[in-house]
Interface confidence: medium
């Protein structure tokens, strides 16, 4: 079903409208500052990044998949791992990097048009069923089969911002990626500290709405560097 396929990087790796910017929404979100991550028995800051815990592939970035870090490891402990490049071994599409898919246990380059058609066919054939297979691998039902008929409302699970209704963007919210409101004037936003850091956030904020930009709050200029507050302000 569409449900079954939505949990796959196969969808993430396709051109729009089925593909597009999935995984971490990139510029679509504004990440909360000073967020901490679990690492062993202590919490780590963004500059000492620890792997992101996950339960399903769609909770990871475009270039990641969700799995146990060690072969035969504790099934309850899964983290987002870097995707596998071409000719590397795989067990499902989500393990392969964008532009590739899993065929006969190996990540191979996808002919985008052919592959997209294959997925659309799979969706059509098995629409409404609880389980379906894609390239021979059984996939668990995940998102609602209505996902692509009705745009996601605030709080509903999403893969990318185009899944969400107008005025919402797709951003990580700890347990999943959900549709959140685009930020209004005066609301707290976040400038990323370094390139790519948006991909590490547990709680992400949307971008500022039209005509607004994320800038340091006037009365916070004197504050210490770490506690500077950014808000959405008129250009």
């Amino acid at each position: 079903t569409l449900n079954s396929v939505l949990n796959s990087n196969a969808i993430k790796n396709l051109p729009p409208p089925l593909g597009g910017a999935a995984g971490h929404p990139g510029s679509a979100v504004s990440a909360a500052p000073g967020i901490l991550y679990p690492g062993g028995n202590k919490y780590q800051t963004i500059d000492n990044y620890q792997p992101y815990p996950c339960a399903e592939d769609e909770e990871c970035g475009t270039d990641e998949y969700c799995a146990s870090p060690t072969r035969g490891g504790d099934a309850g402990v899964q983290i987002c791992l870097a995707c596998r490049k071409r000719r590397k071994r795989c067990m499902r599409h989500a393990m392969c990097c964008p532009g590739n898919y899993c065929k006969n246990g190996i990540c191979v380059s996808s002919d985008q048009n052919h592959f997209r058609g294959e997925i659309e066919e799979t969706i059509t054939e098995s629409f409404g069923n609880d389980h379906s297979t894609l390239d021979g691998y059984s996939r668990r039902t995940t998102l609602s089969s209505k996902m692509y008929h009705t745009k996601g409302q605030e709080g509903s699970v999403c893969l990318r911002s185009s899944d969400c209704a107008s005025g919402l963007c797709c951003a990580r919210h700890f347990w999943s990626k959900i549709c959140k409101p685009v930020l209004k004037e005066g609301q707290v936003c976040t400038k990323h500290r370094r390139k790519g850091s948006h991909g590490l956030e547990i709680f992400q904020r949307c971008y500022c709405g039209e005509g607004l930009s994320c800038r340091i709050q006037k009365d916070h200029h004197q504050a210490s560097n770490s506690s500077r507050l950014h808000t959405c302000q008129r250009h």
Partner: antibody, heavy 116, light 111 residues
Framework: QVQLVESGGGLVQPGGSLRLSCAAS????????MSWVRQAPGKGLEWVSG????????HYADSVKGRFTISRDNSKNTLYLQMNSLRAEDTAVYYC?????????WGQGTLVTVSS | DIALTQPASVSGSPGQSITISCTGT?????????VSWYQQHPGKAPKLMIH???NRPSGVSNRFSGSKSGNTASLTISGLQAEDEADYYC???????????FGGGTKLTVL
């Protein structure tokens, strides 16, 4: 509009079992994580358990781990909480809550009383 | 275990402003920069009033505002009204396993 209706509460003896249900309507149930939160009489809120939209991922508070099981039936738009080996301290109003942007919608709750 | 600490009670007169604090640790309130606030009237279900520390869900009065400084989050209610009398809970999230953590609650009395 969003509606969550809990049922299945009642009086049960220590060591007994009970199964709570939460019927959801007004939203696409299978697109949301869901959870159970309880409140003992005159006390504060305590998160009990959460479940992913697909049901493949579950989380529990330490106080109920191994005794309670959260599950869902997306075809019936229903959330469940199977409670076994009940103790007096499990006496509370049990709320079903949608995990949208945090716990954004709550049911009215169902009272579970564990007493001999 | 994570704990969020709130004052047991606060009070104010109609029209006044009151602030309820919620103090946590670097692994919850301070670290996540993420706190929610819920209002609960006697015998009723809790209602989400503030999420993401300072954002109001639609339908919530703009008299309610949230902020955070260090490991302390605050809920401010301005222009206090009789119907604001209720219990207020702050809430944050623990990381692993996913667990919602609530403060002990604050009873607001409108004098």
């Amino acid at each position: 509009q969003v509606q969550l209706v809990e049922s299945g509460g009642g009086l049960v003896q220590p060591g007994g079992s009970l199964r709570l249900s939460c019927a959801a309507s007004g939203f696409t149930f299978s697109s949301y994580w869901m959870s159970w939160v309880r409140q003992a009489p005159g006390k504060g809120l305590e998160w009990v358990s959460g479940i992913s939209y697909s049901g493949s991922n579950t989380h529990y508070a330490d106080s109920v781990k191994g005794r309670f099981t959260i599950s869902r039936d997306n075809s019936k738009n229903t959330l469940y909480l199977q409670m076994n080996s009940l103790r007096a301290e499990d006496t509370a109003v049990y709320y079903c809550a949608r995990m949208g942007i945090d716990l954004d919608y709550w049911g009215q709750g169902t009272l579970v009383t564990v007493s001999s | 275990d994570i704990a969020l600490t709130q004052p047991a009670s606060v009070s104010g007169s109609p029209g006044q402003s009151i602030t309820i604090s919620c103090t946590g640790t670097s692994s919850d309130v301070g670290g996540f920069n993420y706190v929610s606030w819920y209002q609960q009237h006697p015998g009723k279900a809790p209602k989400l009033m503030i999420h993401d520390g300072s954002n109001r869900p639609s339908g919530v009065s703009n008299r309610f505002s949230g902020s955070k400084s260090g490991n302390t989050a605050s809920l401010t209610i301005s222009g206090l009204q009789a119907e604001d009398e209720a219990d207020y809970y702050c809430q944050s999230w623990d990381v692993s396993p996913i667990t919602a953590v609530f403060g002990g609650g604050t009873k607001l009395t409108v004098l």
